[in-house]
């Protein structure tokens, strides 16, 4: 369950991929897409608002005996827009929504090698958020293999 | 209940390499973080590394060409080495876990007891 | 690398003092702080995370203000077991850098 109903802190911040390319949205036909690109020099980056959740994780789920806590993020680049898993597609996409938000906002927030964070669905453990084929996607991790997999690395910059 | 335990020489010779081992109990090392931190005598505390949950490691920038951090989930352990050693790395060497499964932002809230380890001829 | 800097190195109060300790990040780390409260011979304790939240079992006279560069850690009224030394972190990027502590001496 997710502690309280208000986040424990929130920032602006830029999103980019673990090769510098950044995260941009762009309001099309009335519904946003979202893009991986190499962005000209003058242009400015995207902001997303990173609302910061704690959650607690009871130990009948985490398996080691004890309970825990995570720390799980929603994504919104713009107001009532938030970024959303979509399992059964396996893409992310924006969508306009009330609060409380869907567990589909909800990523868990894993600190990564060379200072990169990783987002994992809340709703599907072990299925992260990705670049594929220059759009954002749902990718599926086997955790003790292939964490460093560099198409799941994401820079924050404020 | 969650415990981590330092363990290791605590006399190495200067030129030598230091070794530490961290063994832990009540949680798993593929979802917690663990670091090293260490304190001089009389001294204030200083990151060495962490052993991070998915594998990857970070380390200090002073030290980075002297340490390394690794594990053995099998035996839930977590290993410290520190090669050529002098006489300014003598100090405390405490082991500590993150407070949020995969995620250090929330800081170290459990901590081994220390072990203290000097370097002299 | 992102420099911690706490201010004063050491304070000398009385028991139900309030005290005020800051630390001064050399870039921008959000919120991303933790303090550690730390007595002779023993490990540090965890006091504060995410700049503001008291950690579990922490009494409530501790408490923790800022973001960005600028943080606090006050002790509204302080207690005989409070005279120690208290250290920052920031946990934004890594390497996660202490600042050089504070020393609560009794007056």
């Known amino acids: 369950s997710i502690t309280g109903i208000s986040p424990i802190t929130e920032s602006l911040a830029s999103l980019s991929t673990y090769n510098d390319q950044s995260i941009t949205f762009a309001l099309e036909d009335e519904s946003y897409e979202i893009y991986v690109e190499d962005l000209k020099k003058d242009k400015k980056k995207d902001k997303v608002l990173l609302s910061y959740y704690e959650s607690q994780h009871p130990s009948s789920e985490s398996g080691d005996g004890v309970d825990g806590k995570m720390l799980m993020v929603t994504l919104s680049p713009t107001k009532d827009f938030w970024l959303q898993a979509n399992n059964k597609e396996h893409s992310v996409e924006l969508h306009k929504c009330e609060k409380p938000l869907p567990d589909q906002a909800f990523f868990v927030l894993h600190n990564r090698s060379f200072n990169c964070v990783s987002f994992e669905c809340k709703t599907d453990p072990g299925v992260f958020i990705g670049v594929k084929d220059n759009h954002l996607a749902l990718i599926k991790v086997d955790y003790s293999e292939n964490l460093g997999s560099e198409n799941i690395l994401f820079k924050l910059s404020e | 209940q969650v415990q981590l335990q330092e363990s290791g020489p605590g006399l190495v010779k200067p030129s030598e390499t230091l070794s530490l081992t961290c063994t832990v109990s009540g949680f798993s090392l593929s979802k917690y973080g663990v670091h090293w931190i260490r304190q001089p005598p009389g001294k204030g505390l200083e990151w060495i590394g962490v052993?991070?949950?998915?594998?990857?490691?970070g380390y200090n920038s002073a030290l980075m060409s002297r340490v390394t951090i690794s594990k053995d989930t099998s035996k839930s352990q977590v290993s410290l080495k520190l090669s050529s050693v002098t006489a300014a790395d003598t100090a405390v060497y405490y082991c500590?876990?993150?407070?949020?499964?995969?995620?250090?932002?929330?800081?170290?809230?459990?901590w081994g007891q220390g072990t203290l380890v000097t370097v002299s001829s | 690398d992102i420099q911690m800097t706490q201010s004063p190195s050491s304070v000398s109060a009385s028991v139900g003092d309030r005290v005020t300790i800051t630390c001064l990040a050399s870039?921008?780390?959000?919120?991303?702080l933790a303090w550690y409260q730390q007595k002779p011979g023993k490990s540090p304790k965890l006091l504060i995370y995410a700049a503001t939240r008291l950690a579990d079992g922490v009494p409530s006279r501790f408490s923790g203000s800022g973001s960005g560069t600028d943080f606090t850690l006050t002790i509204s009224s302080l207690q005989p077991e409070d005279f120690a030394t208290y250290y920052c972190?920031?946990?934004?990027?890594?390497?996660?850098?202490f600042g050089q502590g504070t020393k609560v001496e009794i007056k």
């Open positions: 972190q920031q946990l934004d990027s890594s390497p996660y850098t």
């Open positions: 500590a876990r993150d407070h949020y499964y995969y995620s250090s932002y929330g800081g170290f809230v459990y």
């Open positions: 052993l991070r949950a998915g594998g990857s490691t």
């Open positions: 870039q921008t780390i959000g919120a991303w």
